[in-house]
């Protein structure tokens, strides 16, 4: 476990940007930032979840543009943006920073939000390292920021996977000097394979060397791609500014341990020397005689270093070496917020009040005891009951995030933008309101007809 920290230093027009602020003089505004972390270095869809976490800054100071003045850097919110992560720090990640403007005028619809800039960077970063600085351009804007990942005790290490505990304080007897200052003593971490990279490798079992994403080889010293351009191909990359040598899956020789690389359509194949195997020859020749199967797993094959072994795992364990305990609770078998208990030989669900059954599937209460999450309201009818969920939530108890724009909430042709706190409607000309509900001049030509022919006031009118 640990925290990713982001410090925004400045946000304003970049060199050669607009001479006057593109912030537009619509009255008082303030900035805020959203940070989103995704694991890995792949180009993920913009709407894919922030699997490593997300955070929202406070609002910055109110800012009113002077129409003719050159645009300065805009006033920023105070403090760090912090994204806690629960599991190991992956080492490679995608960082997305969005700069939002909140207009504070007494304009129709209350505060209006608009996305000013969005930058996406794919980075490698070890936890516990120093602050890394960056400058990014997005259109006419320039964003300067620093970031780091740090572990939270008792976790330590570049991936926050080693656990530490404070050494117990010895008590001083009467008349004795104060004891030596408290020191930190780490639980003996697993002894990794000799030579395993301290920077790019880690182990959870003795004798192993597991690599952070982007590194390979038996000792995690071989980058998956030797290009600093993170796999981008072509004459040059506008995002990194670096030149990538010609295309080809064997560039930089991805085969470790002296393996030779041959190209296949759209991929590559490694021919490994004796004693190594795996996609990139990264696995050393372990045999069943080495006892590679943990937790009582049965080893089959692998009589000599040239042949692979297979571990047949006992119930409750998985992984190529039976090293992982199956977390049967991760499938969330207990319904209605029940607490899952994996007893090893069986699963138990401890149900919330008002629910019963092996998986808490029976609802004993009506709306009187029913909780609809996230602002949902309970609706009774015909002996049954259900949750009517607030915008942006769905599911039986309104616990599931729904696409807030799926219900087409913006009226009169307004455009819907999904937003961290719900949605934002950008209204068509002539309409106002949080959901564009109000035609400014319902009888004018700019709006849809307020009362189509044949309808009297008080009659309904439908809009697509």
């Amino acid at each position: 476990a640990g925290v990713f920290e982001l410090q925004i230093h400045s946000f304003g027009p970049g060199p050669g940007g607009a001479p006057r602020s593109p912030y537009s003089a619509r009255g008082p505004c303030r900035l805020f930032f959203r940070v989103c972390l995704k694991p890995g270095l792949s180009e993920e869809a913009a709407e894919s979840p922030c699997a490593l976490g997300a955070a929202l800054s406070a609002r910055g100071p109110v800012y009113t543009e002077q129409p003719e003045a050159p645009a300065p850097d805009l006033p920023l919110p105070n403090g760090l943006l912090q994204v806690p992560f629960r599991d190991a720090w992956p080492g490679t990640f995608s960082l997305i920073i969005e700069t939002w403007r909140e207009e504070l005028g007494d304009q129709i619809g209350g505060p209006a939000w608009s996305l000013l800039a969005r930058v996406t960077r794919r980075r490698r970063l070890a936890a516990g390292g120093p602050w890394a600085g960056d400058i990014q351009r997005a259109g006419a804007w320039e964003l300067r920021f620093s970031y780091r990942a740090r572990c939270e005790l008792p976790a330590v290490g570049t991936a926050c996977t080693r656990l530490c505990r404070p050494r117990s304080a010895s008590r001083c007897g009467p008349g004795l000097r104060p004891c030596a200052p408290l020191e930190d003593e780490c639980e003996a971490p697993p002894v990794c394979r000799a030579g395993c990279s301290l920077e790019h490798g880690f182990c959870e079992q003795p004798g192993e060397c597991r690599c952070l994403e982007g590194w390979t080889g038996p000792l995690c010293m071989v980058p998956v791609s030797t290009s600093s351009c993170l796999g981008l191909r072509g004459p040059s990359s506008t995002t990194t500014g670096c030149l990538v040598p010609g295309p080809g899956p064997c560039d930089g020789n991805p085969c470790a341990n002296g393996g030779s690389c041959s190209e296949t359509p759209g991929s590559f194949e490694c021919t490994c020397p004796r004693g190594f195997y795996g996609l990139r020859c990264e696995v050393s020749g372990v045999t069943c005689a080495d006892g590679p199967c943990f937790n009582g797993g049965l080893c089959v094959g692998g009589a000599d270093p040239d042949s692979a072994y297979i571990c047949h795992c006992p119930p409750g364990f998985q992984g190529s070496n039976c090293e992982k305990r199956v977390d049967r609770c991760s499938l969330q078998p207990c319904r209605n917020g029940g607490l899952c208990l994996d007893l090893g030989h069986a699963l138990r669900c401890r149900c919330r009040a008002g629910f019963a059954g092996p998986r808490c599937e029976h609802d004993l209460n009506d709306c009187a005891g029913r909780a609809c999450a996230n602002g949902g309201t309970c609706v009774e009818g015909g002996g049954a009951h259900r949750c009517s969920c607030a915008l942006g939530f769905g599911g039986r108890d309104c616990r599931e995030r729904a696409d807030p724009c799926a219900a087409r909430p913006c009226a009169h042709g307004g455009r819907c933008y999904a937003h961290f706190s719900g949605l934002v409607c950008a209204c068509a000309p002539g309409y106002m309101g949080a959901r564009c509900e109000f035609p400014v001049h319902p009888d004018g030509v700019s709006a849809l007809p307020a009362a189509p022919p044949g309808l009297r006031p008080g009659d309904p009118q439908r809009y697509p």
Epitope: G109, G110, P111, T377, S388, L391, A407, R408, P409, A411, H412, G433, A434, R435, E437, F438, P442, A450, G458, D459, P460, Q461, R462, Y463
Partner: nanobody, 119 residues
């Protein structure tokens, strides 16, 4: 089907106050908005104030600081408190109700109530 009934209009002197009320009967939805519009003699109907289902409010520049819109969800009602009335506020005031049901939007208008500001 939703019907809107306005009340509270009348004659008032400049500088005086009035409160307009509008009740929606029928089957109002939880995702809705209420508004007040007015049509002055010889002019087209214009938005005065509106309140969305999330409680956010909108006002036209000409009434900001003088008029206040509010709603009572339990009573399916919306109110317009009008202070510091001026002669140019004389108009027929219409209640407006907008709702979204299953992705289909519908709007409703009341019959209007006359507000006359005159000494």
């Amino acid at each position: 089907e939703v019907q809107l009934v306005e009340s509270g209009g009348g004659l008032v002197q400049p500088g005086g106050s009035l409160t307009l009320s509008c009740v929606a009967s029928g089957s109002p939805s939880s995702i809705n908005a209420y508004g007040w519009y007015r049509r002055a003699p010889g002019k087209q109907r214009e938005l005065v104030a509106g309140i969305s289902s999330d409680g956010s409010k909108v006002y036209s520049d000409s009434v900001k600081g003088r008029f206040t819109i509010s709603r009572d969800n339990a009573k399916n009602s919306v109110y317009l408190q009008m202070n510091s009335l001026r002669a140019e506020d004389t108009a027929v005031y219409y209640c407006y109700y907008f709702r979204t049901v299953s992705g289909s939007s519908m709007s409703y208008w009341g019959q209007g109530t006359l507000v006359t500001v005159s000494s």
